[in-house]
Interface confidence: low
């Protein structure tokens, strides 16, 4: 027999045994030109001393063989004795070490068996109703294909799936999407309606992340508020390493996870921008405000579930930093100014109502006044802090108010609203004899004492009605009792108490009249 022809004789070896794990496999045959054909196959196992024979049986029942030696690819023409227009059955027999191994058979019409290409170029991946959708452009002149996919995870072997028939310029496939593990996909194609024809090679790997991006293990901590009114948010984390299937461990775009930090400043709701997203490792400086912080993990399918933490407001207060002057036209606050052209946010909230939304006002950018102070004024009609109750006031500052991470806390303090002078007047002043020349004066705490740092002192005034002589006694804001001594028996006195703030003298309580009885000796 000539080497270019299929030899219609018995092959020069004994019968084949197809039960071996090694041997020839993955035989594919197809037309490569108008009159040229090619068959190729894989050989598993040691190749030394192996001789391959491509066997062919015609529909008439006559069989022939090509001897290819150690080669696993053979080209032949339509003149080689193999019918190309009719169905033929082909297989490979490999002879080695006195035994013969046989490949699975393929039955096909060679002329119609065109070598199909796998999906080439960009395979678009998207999520559709909980499944994975892959889409690609049909290779040139190859419309009409059957498509299969295979997929594996880092811990599983390949599983085969069917994409169904395709008959368009673009082809697509719906595949399973894993929730928590990455997958590697490959696709292959063959001519539609020719069951015996050969499959294309597998496509390049398509690497698909899990539907849920892996969450990093994150712990936040926040430093003390510095003198500049800012505190550093720090993070301790361990990124979650997602194991990848074998074919995705080289350059395999598509499985990346991006982590971002989302900051939401809860305080000062009247400012321009409350939320900012920034890279996870850019640990920002924060003001003393309350924040919600979220870590967002995203992959090619979009963001996954958030992890959210609450960072409470820094409650440290400086009671002396704020001056408040109440006049007939309204109220003005003064505080040490920051740099030129600073915007301030003044926020206030009744104490005990911390759960409700605070009221706030944003100033226009202002420069320090000649005394180095910044100011904010409001009229009585505005109703701001008009009720006679304790308010928590926080002032924030920023030279760039639209940049969330550039706000700082200027001060945090308390203020008693409304007519503090009258509202703070101590009530229930009572006088009790203490000794022959002294009395004990008691009163109920001023409403101002509910407001931390606001009540500077009580003043107790005692007037001798005979001589009109007046004495005043300062009392610590934590005390509600004082002893008046060196009093004279039989003289009428009046006593009054007032409560003072740092910037305001209180109103005297109603005068309380008393006298010490003259002791009559027996």
């Amino acid at each position: 027999c000539r080497t270019s022809e299929c030899c219609f004789q018995d092959p020069p070896y004994s019968d084949a045994d197809s039960g071996s794990a090694s041997g020839p496999r993955d035989l594919s045959c197809y037309r490569i030109s108008s009159a040229g054909y090619e068959c190729s196959w894989q050989y598993e196992g040691p190749t030394a001393g192996v001789s391959h024979f491509l066997r062919c049986c015609l529909s008439s029942g006559r069989c022939c063989y090509f001897a290819t030696g150690s080669a696993t690819r053979l080209q032949f023409s339509d003149q080689a004795g193999v019918s190309v227009l009719h169905t033929v059955t082909l297989w490979v027999e490999s002879w080695a070490r006195n035994r013969t191994e046989k490949s699975p058979e393929v039955t096909l019409q060679l002329y119609k068996s065109v070598k199909y290409k796998p999906p080439l170029g960009d395979i678009k991946v998207s999520k559709l109703a909980g499944q994975l959708r892959m889409e690609w452009e049909t290779p040139d002149n190859q419309v009409g294909a059957e498509v299969q996919f295979r997929h594996r995870t880092p811990s599983s072997s390949w599983k085969l799936g069917d994409c169904g028939p395709q008959d368009d310029d673009t082809e697509s496939c719906l595949c399973p999407l894993e929730m928590n593990v990455a997958q590697e996909f490959q696709l292959r194609r063959r001519r539609l309606g020719s069951q015996g024809s050969s499959w294309s090679k597998w496509s390049s790997p398509v690497c698909v992340p899990p539907e849920n991006p892996p969450q990093p293990q994150v712990r936040f901590s926040v430093e003390q508020l510095g003198r500049d009114g800012r505190r550093r948010l720090t993070l301790k984390e361990q990124p979650t390493q997602l194991e990848l299937p074998e074919g995705c461990q080289g350059p395999a775009p598509g499985v990346e996870v991006t982590y971002q930090l989302q900051l939401h400043m809860l305080s000062c709701p009247c400012k321009a921008k409350a939320t900012r997203t920034l890279p996870l490792e850019k640990m920002p400086y924060l003001s003393g405000a309350a924040y919600n912080v979220a870590v967002i993990s995203s992959n090619r399918f979009g963001p996954g579930p958030n992890q959210t933490w609450h960072i409470p407001a820094d409650t440290h207060t400086e009671p002396v930093a704020l001056n408040i002057s109440v006049g007939t036209n309204g109220t003005t606050m003064y505080w040490p100014a920051r740099a030129q052209s600073t915007t301030y946010c003044i926020e206030w909230q009744p104490v005990g109502q911390e759960g409700s939304l605070a009221t706030c006002n944003l100033t226009a950018p202002q420069d320090p006044d000649p005394a180095g102070m910044a100011t904010y004024s409001w009229s009585r009609e505005s109703g701001a802090m008009g009720q006679e109750k304790c308010y928590h006031i926080t002032i924030f500052a920023s030279a760039h108010p639209k940049k969330l991470t550039l706000w700082s806390t200027v001060l945090s303090t308390y203020h008693f609203g409304g007519n503090a002078s009258a509202a703070g007047t101590p009530h229930h002043v009572s006088v009790k004899n203490h000794s022959l020349d002294s009395v004990s004066v008691d009163w109920a705490p001023s409403l101002l004492s509910t407001c931390p740092g606001v009540l500077k002192e009580y003043v107790v005034r005692c007037r001798d009605e005979d001589s009109n002589q007046v004495s005043e006694h300062p009392v610590q804001p934590t005390e509600t009792q004082v002893t008046l001594s060196d009093l004279r028996a039989g003289v009428a006195y009046t006593v009054q108490v007032r409560a003072d703030t740092a910037w305001l003298r209180g109103a005297w309580s109603q005068p309380q009249r008393f006298s010490i009885k003259v002791q009559v000796s027996d």
């Epitope: 892996p214 990093p216 979650t240 990346e256 996870v257 991006t258 982590y259 890279p279 996870l280 490792e281």
Partner: nanobody, 123 residues
Framework: QVQLVESGGGLVQPGGSLRLSCIAS????????MKWVRRPPGKGLEWVSV????????KYSDAVRGRFTISRDNAKNTLYLQMNSLKPEDTAVYYC????????????????RGQGTQVTVSS
């Protein structure tokens, strides 16, 4: 074409030191966060350390913190890993990896990676 070439691995006794280098080409090195990852024998990939594009943000896994130091020289397109107080459990193939952005946390998956350099810690 991204290329990452690691060197500096070898056999070292417990307690010893090694310095790994990784020369990068095919992309603007100074624009990307870089990482070291490793694959111990018979195990999956482990994250070791990461440094962002400009260098100020550096992070380490708990297993190496205090013993390993990551650094980069953007002028030389080179990433380094100084490994001190090595332990047998540090035995692995060490890979240099490029993230998909300048941010140290832009990716926990290493889409571009070198061929690796073997580090063996044994007495």
């Amino acid at each position: 074409q991204v290329q990452l070439v690691e060197s500096g691995g070898g056999l070292v006794q417990p307690g010893g030191s090694l310095r790994l280098s990784c020369i990068a080409s095919g992309f603007t090195f100074s624009d990307y966060a870089m990482k070291w990852v490793r694959r111990p024998p018979g195990k999956g990939l482990e994250w070791v350390s990461v440094i962002d594009s400009e260098g100020p943000t550096i992070k380490y896994s708990d297993a190496v913190r205090g013993r390993f130091t990551i650094s980069r020289d953007n002028a030389k397109n080179t990433l380094y890993l100084q490994m001190n107080s090595l332990k047998p459990e540090d035995t692995a193939v060490y890979y240099c990896a490029k993230s998909n952005g300048g941010s140290a946390f832009s990716s926990v998956l290493y889409t571009d990676r070198g061929q690796g350099t073997q580090v063996t810690v044994s007495s």
